[in-house]
Interface confidence: low
């Protein structure tokens, strides 16, 4: 969490962003809240980007001013112009590029004063995992596919039954690259399972962690994924 | 080096079709906003139209002068811009450029231009 | 879509004079770019975003203004500065570049 401040006394409002991931080709959100006006006409929102020299998006007098924004976020940014009156800055950004990471600036002007905050933005792809039996193996054996990852994660195989073993000798993971050229399919194969056991598959990178687990009994399979991205720290 | 090279123009008849071309090099052409502005003699610059750069799915927008008549297209493997030009009037006879939007919504790089003229 | 008018149409100015012309806007803009073009040339970008020169553009050029005002000036004007000189401005609803009528500049 990064909470700023306006730089003069009474003159100075706050302005609170939280660090976030986008998933590149997904629509993203750049958390931003201040102190609320009364009046709508009176707020105005500039979200700058460093070492872009246009602006990333800018709102005033109630609607979006975008004469000076930057060509490379033309077309894919919003406020939530409802929720501006509440204080809320946030902006979406669409179609999320890898290009779009970096340092990013909340700056607000209401009737109270101004303030800003940085946001640190990073961008990649994550994507849930998929866990199967996989029935074309010779042995039971467990096939964990998530298809669409960047920058190249790990990839950890775990046990409930046996916490803390080494799966490294007994798995084999491969990265496929996408028709895009950018993202990545993870495959993940175990080999030697056995049942009436839980196995996680957890793939990791800087900005997100995703499990996807699975339990294999005689009579049943259960799946359930999760994930999670890493670095939403509030400033 | 930034270099636009337009090419394409001449004499045409009424209700005739041209292509225009921008050869262009010197800059990662599917970064930019491309667009076509015209000049007929001794009057003032009109934009025809612009299409956007990769990120935003080069779509395209025309003003509405030429909306319908006039298309235009990038191939971004050759970094080469084109204006299709169809059902041709006598008030379509001017010189046309083709423009790189810089990063602040202005045209930074312009063409030398290609000269059109519309007459039977 | 927002028009630009330009004024006046013709500017005559002796050498070391000081002169302004104006753009105004049918409605508010919040930056408007400048364009100088000679006879047989292509425009060449002038002053962009209101105030800023581009490349090469003698510090005598300036630019000013805000709402639906804005103006070039030329704090002493030079023979080399003949021309015509277009403003333009990015409207984004509807999504579109448009060009003011022109001034054209000639030195007496």
């Known amino acids: 969490l990064i909470i700023g401040f306006g730089i003069s006394g009474r003159h100075s409002i706050t302005v609170t962003t939280v660090a976030s991931a986008g998933n590149i080709g997904e629509d993203g959100i750049l958390s931003c809240t201040f102190e609320p006006d009364i009046k709508l006409s009176d707020i105005v929102i500039q979200w700058l980007k460093e070492g872009v020299l246009g602006l990333v998006h800018e709102f005033k007098e109630g609607k979006d001013e975008l004469s000076e924004q930057d060509e490379m976020f033309r077309g894919r940014t919003a406020v939530f112009a409802d929720q501006v009156i509440v204080g809320n800055a946030s902006l979406r950004l669409k179609n999320v590029q890898l290009t779009d990471a970096g340092t990013y600036k909340c700056y607000i002007i209401t009737s109270k004063g101004k303030g800003n905050a940085n946001l640190e933005y990073k961008t990649g792809a994550f994507s849930m995992p998929e866990v199967n039996v996989d029935y074309n193996a010779s042995s039971e054996t467990l096939r964990c596919e998530a298809p669409r990852w960047f920058p190249q994660p790990t990839v950890v195989w775990a046990s409930q039954v046996d916490q803390g073993a080494n799966f490294s000798e007994v798995s084999n993971t491969s990265f496929e690259l996408n028709s895009e050229n950018v993202t990545m399919k993870v495959v993940s194969v175990l080999y030697n399972v056995t049942i009436n056991n839980t196995y996680s598959c957890m793939i990791e990178n800087d900005i997100a962690k995703a499990t996807g687990d699975i339990k294999v009994t005689e009579s049943e399979i259960k799946r359930r994924s999760h994930l999670q991205l890493l670095n939403s720290k509030a400033s | 080096e930034v270099k636009l090279v337009e090419s394409g123009g001449g004499l045409v008849q009424p209700g005739g079709s041209v292509r225009l071309s921008c050869a262009t090099s010197?800059?990662?052409?599917?970064?930019?906003?491309m667009s076509w502005v015209r000049q007929p003699p001794g009057k003032a610059l009109e934009l025809l139209g612009f299409?956007?750069?990769?990120?935003?799915?080069?779509?395209?927008e025309y003003s509405a002068s030429v909306k319908g008549r006039f298309t235009m297209s990038r191939d971004n493997s050759q970094s080469v811009l084109y204006l299709q030009m169809n059902t041709l009037r006598a008030e379509d006879s001017a010189t046309y450029y083709c423009?790189?939007?810089?990063?602040?919504?202005?045209?930074?790089?312009w063409g030398q231009g290609t000269t059109l003229t519309v007459s039977s | 879509q927002i028009v630009l008018s330009q004024s006046p149409a013709i500017l005559s100015a002796s050498p070391g004079e000081k002169v302004t012309m104006t753009c105004r806007a049918s409605?508010?803009?919040?930056?408007m770019h400048w364009y100088q073009q000679k006879p047989g040339s292509s425009p060449k970008p002038w002053i962009y975003a209101t105030s800023n020169l581009a490349s090469g553009v003698p510090t005598r050029f300036s630019g000013s203004g805000s709402g639906t005002s804005y103006s070039l000036t030329i704090s002493r004007v030079e023979a080399e500065d003949a021309a015509t000189y277009y403003c333009?401005?990015?409207?984004?609803?509807?999504?579109?570049?448009?060009f003011g009528g022109g001034t054209k500049l000639e030195i007496k």
């Open positions: 010197g800059f990662t052409f599917s970064d930019y906003y």
């Open positions: 333009q401005q990015w409207s984004s609803n509807p999504p579109m570049y448009t």
């Open positions: 423009a790189r939007d810089s990063h602040r919504t202005y045209f930074d790089y």
């Open positions: 299409i956007r750069n990769k990120a935003n799915g080069y779509t395209r």
């Open positions: 409605s508010s803009v919040s930056s």
